[in-house]
Interface confidence: medium
């Protein structure tokens, strides 16, 4: 599993690389394929 | 105002695929992920992934791996659902559900009103 | 994955009763993760409480969410007829994200 505390500065626990995205853009409703500080959060 | 509007209902045979549709329409469609949802009937709600229209990035669940997959048409606005080798125990609602804006708390805001997919020979 | 299990499983209640359905994880839960979910027979599930304690837009203010860890509640001061549904939790903390079994409430 992972487990993501976006409310402490990104910090992720048990986190599986499963993939990365090039389109690192703010949108903020699409968090999923988004890179934030380096790590792929979803 | 946000609308989800799902593809009809489908009547498939066992093996075959189908793919349902989810036009989207009231919001910016690359700014919000949209997930996609089983529900058996008259059972609960189980999430089978996420799909980031932006990009198309998803994120599946590992138990529908080779099961479904998630696209998307940034020129009309709208998700797509393919559903392949399918069985009996594919037979259900499938619900698209855009998160909310703020996604990093993966709340669904706004759902369709579901696409019924039976599977009988 | 984590797992979550609400309870009871179906209640019914008279109305102006105060309902209190729980979700229970099997690994704790930031709070910000935990939403509730309200689905009426034959339509679609809708938000209905985000983030533990945030109230959907439109969403009567009778209903209100509270917990941490691994345990939630979803609380309706007053019971209406209209409330009759299924009501479901649902975490976005862990991939994959997962609902709760289910709570059918009904009205005496």
């Known amino acids: 599993d992972a487990e993501f505390r976006h409310d402490s500065g990104y910090e992720v626990h048990h986190q599986k690389l499963v993939f990365f995205a090039e389109d690192v853009g703010s949108n903020k409703g699409a968090i999923i394929g988004l890179m934030v500080g380096g790590v792929v959060i979803a | 105002e946000v609308q989800l509007q799902q593809s009809g209902p489908e009547l498939v045979k066992p093996g075959a695929s189908v793919k349902i549709s989810c036009k989207t329409s009231?919001?910016?469609?690359?700014?919000?992920?949209m997930h996609w949802v089983k529900q058996i009937h008259g059972k609960s709600l189980e999430w089978i992934g996420g799909?980031?229209?932006?990009?198309?990035?998803?994120n599946n669940n590992q138990k529908f791996e080779g099961k479904a997959t998630l696209t998307v048409d940034k020129s009309s606005s709208t998700a797509y659902m393919e559903l392949r080798s399918l069985t009996s125990e594919d037979s259900a609602v499938y619900y698209c559900?855009?998160?909310?804006?703020?996604?990093?708390?993966?709340?669904?805001?706004?759902w369709g009103q579901g696409t019924s997919v039976t599977v009988s020979s | 994955e984590i797992v979550l299990t609400q309870s009871p499983t179906t209640m019914a209640a008279s109305p102006g009763e105060k309902i209190t359905i729980t979700c229970s994880g099997s690994?704790?839960?930031?709070?910000?993760?935990l939403h509730w979910y309200q689905q009426k027979p034959g339509f679609s599930p809708k938000l209905l409480i985000y983030?533990?304690?945030n109230l959907a837009s439109g969403v009567p203010t009778r209903f209100s969410g509270s917990g941490s860890g691994t345990s939630y509640s979803l609380t309706i001061g007053t019971m209406e007829a209209e409330d009759v549904a299924t009501y479901y939790c649902?975490?976005?903390?862990?991939?994959?994200?997962?609902f709760g079994s289910g709570t059918k409430l009904e009205i005496k």
């Open positions: 009231g919001y910016t469609f690359t700014e919000n992920t």
């Open positions: 690994s704790s839960i930031i709070s910000n993760y």
């Open positions: 799909i980031n229209p932006n990009n198309g990035v998803t």
């Open positions: 983030r533990t304690s």
């Open positions: 559900a855009r998160s909310d804006y703020d996604a990093l708390y993966y709340s669904m805001d706004c």
């Open positions: 649902q975490q976005g903390s862990s991939i994959p994200f997962t």
